[in-house]
């Protein structure tokens, strides 16, 4: 019967006793940078071309015995997971292997860099269809390796990497920490994070999504018909490389940003038990398990958005944190979060011709995160409208005054350290949805966008009694672009988007008195694009 991992990534409409997805990724070439492989294994024979590229360090130890089947083990298994004719994800994809890991599975940054350059040159000499590069390896943080990945990604190549098996923050490793790379953590048959001995899958904001990575059956280099189970984030990354190959084969014009957004959109949501992750990493780690789209076409009409968390600002008084969207994405809103609750809000600002989201720490604060809502919005023209702190007691307000511009997000930022303490909440007048409101001491920033057919609406959920968390979700067909809390709730730690839900977090209710200040209101801005919907109908 179908292996658990293939069943897990397959939408229900394709499920059968045999895994037979509609398109096998035949238009895509997948480059594998790993160990040597046994290319005559019947699972991958004729599907994998072994290039003459080899750049590996000497094996450690004078008594090391180089045994071909052991040298080939990791790479052969991964090639099988990506494109194996029986237990592979993208059964139609062709692969090319480059040897950058030795028989002990060790490599060097320089070897990987030269391998990436080899791929770039191959692409220039003989351009083919879409390229996916699988990097099932992880080492310490390397600025130079991340930069090389960025260059290749900007040349139109999709890079997929393992998050690492160190039960640690993936941002401490490369290439996992490179923003342009799709970084994959590992889950098991119970959708739980994979434990590997005393360690396990990496986690954190640098992980884009998770995929099956425990007890994965695949080609074994022991013999031509042998199969074996292996576990790790390499196996998880191989699944995503296969899914990416399938998506790109169905839609070869997809950009990296579009592919990443689709991978996130079609993932299974909120199935991972977050208790496995360290407490401070739970909010930062995406609760997503990769899956194939239910249909390889017809997703183009949706407005895709994702949440991008910044690195932690650090605790100094004037510390800031910045979250950035990918080059092809629009920043539609900006929010902030602090575990201590001491923060000075956030604002959208231009940096290098592109909007970024900056969060500000407050005196006595342990630090903040900036949270960007990054969306795919073709032909968008977005700007930020700012209102300085108001004199009036009604608070600060700002709206989108340009014709055809709609409100996609609200941010507020203040200079005073104790904003909102002992002050009554500011209520937003009804019937003015295209407007952001805030404390009179705060400057308010409205993200206003014009794009063909874009329409947005505000949705609120208020709870009069104190709650640790208040949420409001956008309904089917609408996408969450903005997430914020109504001002006046002094104990708010911050707001952030999780998939299509706006989450407003407050201090532990046991430490806050249930006064009127306990009221918490989460505000979601939900958008959709009629233009994209019509365009997809015309294409079909």
């Amino acid at each position: 019967s179908i292996p658990w991992n293939l069943e897990r990534i397959t939408p229900p409409r394709y499920r059968a006793d045999e895994y037979q997805p509609p398109d096998g990724g035949s238009l895509v070439e997948v480059y594998l940078l790993d160990t040597s492989i046994q290319s005559d294994h019947r699972e991958i024979e004729g599907r994998v071309m072994v290039t003459d590229f080899e750049n590996v360090p000497e094996e450690d130890g004078t008594r090391f015995h180089r045994q071909a089947s052991k040298c080939d083990s990791h790479g052969t298994h991964l090639a099988g997971v990506v494109s194996g004719r029986d237990a592979g994800v993208a059964k139609g994809a062709s692969m090319r292997s480059l040897r950058v890991l030795n028989c002990q599975g060790k490599g060097t940054v320089s070897g990987t860099l030269i391998g990436l350059e080899f791929i770039r040159k191959s692409q220039l000499v003989q351009p083919v269809g879409p390229l996916v590069v699988l990097l099932p390896l992880a080492g310490g943080y390397s600025r130079v390796l991340n930069a090389a990945c960025q260059r290749l990604a900007r040349a139109g190549v999709v890079l997929v990497t393992a998050a690492g098996n160190f039960r640690d923050d993936a941002c401490l490793y490369s290439p996992a920490s490179a923003p342009e790379v799709i970084t994959v953590g590992a889950t098991n048959a119970q959708d739980q994070p994979v434990t590997l001995g005393t360690l396990g899958t990496n986690f954190g904001r640098c992980v884009d999504l998770f995929a099956p990575g425990e007890d994965i059956i695949g080609a074994s280099s022991d013999c031509s018909t042998c199969f074996v189970s292996q576990s790790g984030t390499s196996q998880a990354a191989a699944h995503v490389a296969g899914i990416a190959a399938m998506m790109l084969s169905a839609e070869p014009e997809l950009t990296l940003a579009e592919l990443r957004q689709r991978l996130i959109h079609f993932s299974a949501k909120d199935v991972i038990n977050e208790a496995w992750f360290p407490e401070d990493q739970r909010v930062l780690t995406p609760n997503l398990v990769a899956a194939l789209p239910p249909s390889t076409h017809g997703a183009g009409w949706q407005l895709f958005c994702r949440t991008v968390w910044s690195a932690h600002s650090g605790p100094t008084r004037m510390a800031t944190a910045v979250a950035r969207c990918a080059p092809d994405e629009e920043l539609l809103s900006c929010s902030s979060f602090s575990r201590s609750g001491k923060r000075r809000g956030e604002r959208m600002e231009a940096q290098g011709g592109k909007l970024v989201c900056r969060a500000h720490n407050a005196f006595g604060g342990e630090g903040v995160y900036a949270i960007a809502r990054c969306c795919l919005l073709p032909q968008a023209n977005c700007s930020v409208h700012t209102a300085p702190p108001a004199e009036a007691s009604m608070g600060t307000r700002v709206h989108c005054h340009q014709q055809g511009h709609v409100l996609t997000g609200c941010s507020s930022h203040w200079e005073v350290e104790d904003l909102g303490t002992h002050k009554p909440p500011v209520l937003r007048p009804r019937g003015q949805p295209n407007q952001c409101v805030g404390h009179r001491e705060a400057s308010i920033h409205a993200s206003c966008c014009h794009a063909p057919g874009l329409e947005c609406k505000v949705k609120e959920h208020g709870i009069p009694a104190p709650q640790e968390q208040v949420t409001v979700a956008c309904e089917e067909g609408w996408t969450l672009t903005g997430c914020s809390a109504l001002p006046g709730t002094s104990h708010v730690l911050g707001a952030y988007a999780v998939d299509n839900t706006c989450v407003v977090r407050s201090r532990d209710v046991s430490t806050t008195g249930s006064t009127s200040e306990g009221a918490v209101t989460a505000v979601a801005i939900c958008c959709r694009s009629r233009h994209l919907a019509q365009a997809s109908q015309e294409l079909q």
Epitope: R42, D222, C223, T225, C226, F227
Partner: antibody, heavy 119, light 113 residues
């Protein structure tokens, strides 16, 4: 039920061409390998090669490479073994058998096709 | 190629007696990654195609009587018929299925004494 049904016996002259067939039913034909096995009169079993109908991947025994061609038409769940120019030494019983990727031994066999090549 | 050698070439056993067939491979067919022996046994009766009896050296195929058993590991294997029945008269073949080309033993003919 799961079965492989082979085409009937053939009597041919040396130099003639021939294509024999093996039709699978009762299972997902594209997800199993089909092997061809020769048994010359009074002799043992010799593995000739296999095909994976899902993508028409083939692997031949070097002893048979260039002597025969293995193919498949997945739309009709049928595998083929063909000769472009028969020899008297090709006289034998030919069996098709299926095997699964995770159980790479032949669990189901066709009834066999007797090929006689004689002038 | 992995050469499979069976012994004896033929064997005559009384009804109800034990029949033992040996098979030796020229290289090990036991693989450490899954600790399995890639060896099968087939039975072929006159005028019939071969029938799978044993796989992974010792796992009996469903529907095969329990008087048939397989043992051995690495390079040396045995097929045992614990109590020979009249319907067991046939030629028995071992096969390695780990490496291309797949190879069979030359066969052992089992008859009733």
């Amino acid at each position: 039920q799961v079965q492989l049904v082979q085409s009937g016996a053939e009597v041919k002259k040396p130099g003639e061409s021939l294509k024999i067939s093996c039709k699978g039913s009762g299972y997902s034909f594209t997800n199993y390998y089909i092997s061809w096995v020769r048994q010359m009169p009074g002799k043992g079993l010799e593995w000739m090669g296999l095909i994976y109908p899902g993508d028409s991947y083939t692997h031949y025994n070097p002893s048979f490479q260039g002597q025969v061609t293995i193919s498949a038409d997945k739309s009709i769940s049928t595998a083929y073994l063909q000769w472009s120019s028969l020899k008297a030494s090709d006289t034998a019983m030919y069996y098709c058998a299926r095997d699964h990727w995770y159980k790479p031994f032949s669990d189901i066999w066709g009834q066999g096709t007797l090929v006689t090549v004689s002038s | 190629d992995i050469v499979m050698t069976q012994s004896p070439d033929s064997l005559a056993v009384s009804l109800g007696e034990r029949a033992t067939i040996n098979c030796r491979s020229s290289q090990s067919v036991l693989y450490s990654s899954n600790n399995k022996n890639y060896l099968a046994w087939y039975q072929q009766k006159p005028g019939q195609p071969p029938k799978l009896l044993i796989y992974w050296a010792s796992t009996r195929e469903s529907g095969v009587p329990d008087r048939f058993s397989g043992s051995g590991s690495g390079t040396d294997f045995t097929l045992t018929i614990s109590s020979l029945q009249a319907e067991d008269v046939a030629v028995y073949y071992c096969q390695q299925y780990s490496s291309f080309p797949i190879t069979f033993g030359q066969g052992t003919k089992v008859e009733i004494k």
